[in-house]
């Protein structure tokens, strides 16, 4: 099993541009989670989906952030417009 697959691995963008992160969960997993990690703020849960439905997006109250899960095998996290403080490692995770 390839595990959770994210793309891109690295992203550099200018402030104000749109950024889209992609995730392919493990096949058969019905929960998907997006996290953000920075030195200053630690690990933050942004949103999670169960059976493609967003359950809790309270970790991303800024409407610059949006996430979708159109089907069981794909999710996107979009930031528009991006800001310097969005610089972080973004993790996608999935579970049964």
């Amino acid at each position: 099993d390839a595990g959770v697959i994210q793309s891109p691995r690295h992203e550099v963008t200018e402030m104000g541009q749109e950024v889209t992160l992609r995730c392919k969960p493990i096949s058969g997993h019905n929960s998907l989670f997006w996290y953000r990690q920075t030195m200053m703020r630690g690990l933050e849960l942004l949103i999670y989906f169960n059976n493609n439905v967003p359950i809790d997006d309270s970790g991303m109250p800024e409407d610059r952030f949006s996430a979708k899960m159109p089907n069981a095998s794909f999710s996107t996290l979009k930031i528009q417009p991006s800001e310097p403080r969005d610089s972080a490692v973004y993790f996608c995770a999935s579970s049964l």
Epitope: E44, S58, G59, P61
Partner: antibody
Framework: EVQLVESGGGLVQPGGSLRLSCAAS????????MHWVRQAPGKGLEWVSY????????YYADTLKGRFTISRDNSKNTLYLQMNSLRAEDTAVYYC??????????WGQGTTVTVSS | DNQLTQSPSFLSASVGDRVTITCRAS?????IYWYQQKPGKAPKLLIY???NLAPGVPSRFSGSGSGNEYTLTISSLQPEDFATYYC?????????FGQGTKLEIK
């Protein structure tokens, strides 16, 4: 029916502390974000702080960082605001509000904080 | 911080009038949210995501706009609409409010 009930306000001297509480009912408190907003007498609304469902994401108004601390206890369906080093300009009605529709869809009735010697 | 400026700050109008309140942002925002507040009461959400009416809000209220400029329109003022109106942005923390527009009976 969604209900938010603030408590803990009162009269406090400059430099003092208060802890406000917001008791939530009528919805799944542990599944959503919560805000504090304040309104000084005769003035407009001022956003104070936000906390996500699991407390991993927290934001503060720049002017309040370091003095105010937001927290929550999901087992008690309660939101808190710890306010330290209080100043006269912190005198206001403090509201808790539920995050909903991307905004604040339900508000409490408010609790009054007066900072005066 | 993104500063929101509402105009006018005060507005006198009569029952049946059509009124428009403008909210201008110092930096572009994705959406604007509108609240109504009556004296001694908590604010009430009116419009979310720029143009969506909150549950129970009459259809005489509408919202529009994009970028830096947004509007709240009341098509035909009713006695219960006399209140103070606030815009707010959630595009970027801190989640600033406009200074408010007080709508008074002429």
């Amino acid at each position: 029916e969604v209900q938010l009930v603030e408590s803990g306000g009162g009269l406090v001297q400059p430099g003092g502390s208060l802890r406000l509480s917001c008791a939530a009912s009528g919805f799944t408190f542990s599944n959503g974000g919560m805000h504090w907003v304040r309104q000084a007498p005769g003035k407009g609304l001022e956003w104070v702080s936000y906390i996500s469902s699991g407390s991993s994401t927290i934001y503060y108004a720049d002017t309040l960082k370091g003095r105010f601390t937001i927290s929550r206890d999901n087992s008690k369906n309660t939101l808190y605001l710890q306010m330290n080093s209080l100043r006269a300009e912190d005198t206001a009605v403090y509201y808790c509000a539920r995050r909903g529709e991307g905004a604040m869809d339900y508000w409490g009735q408010g609790t009054t904080v007066t900072v005066s010697s | 911080d993104n500063q929101l400026t509402q105009s006018p700050s005060f507005l006198s109008a009569s029952v049946g009038d059509r009124v428009t309140i403008t909210c201008r942002a110092s930096s572009s925002v994705n959406y604007i949210y509108w609240y109504q507040q009556k004296p001694g009461k908590a604010p009430k959400l009116l419009i979310y995501y720029t143009s969506n009416l909150a549950p129970g809000v009459p259809s005489r209220f509408s919202g529009s706009g994009s970028g830096n400029e947004y509007t709240l329109t009341i098509s035909s003022l009713q006695p219960e609409d006399f209140a103070t109106y606030y815009c707010q942005q959630f595009t970027s923390s801190p989640f600033t409010f406009g200074q408010g527009t007080k709508l008074e009976i002429k």
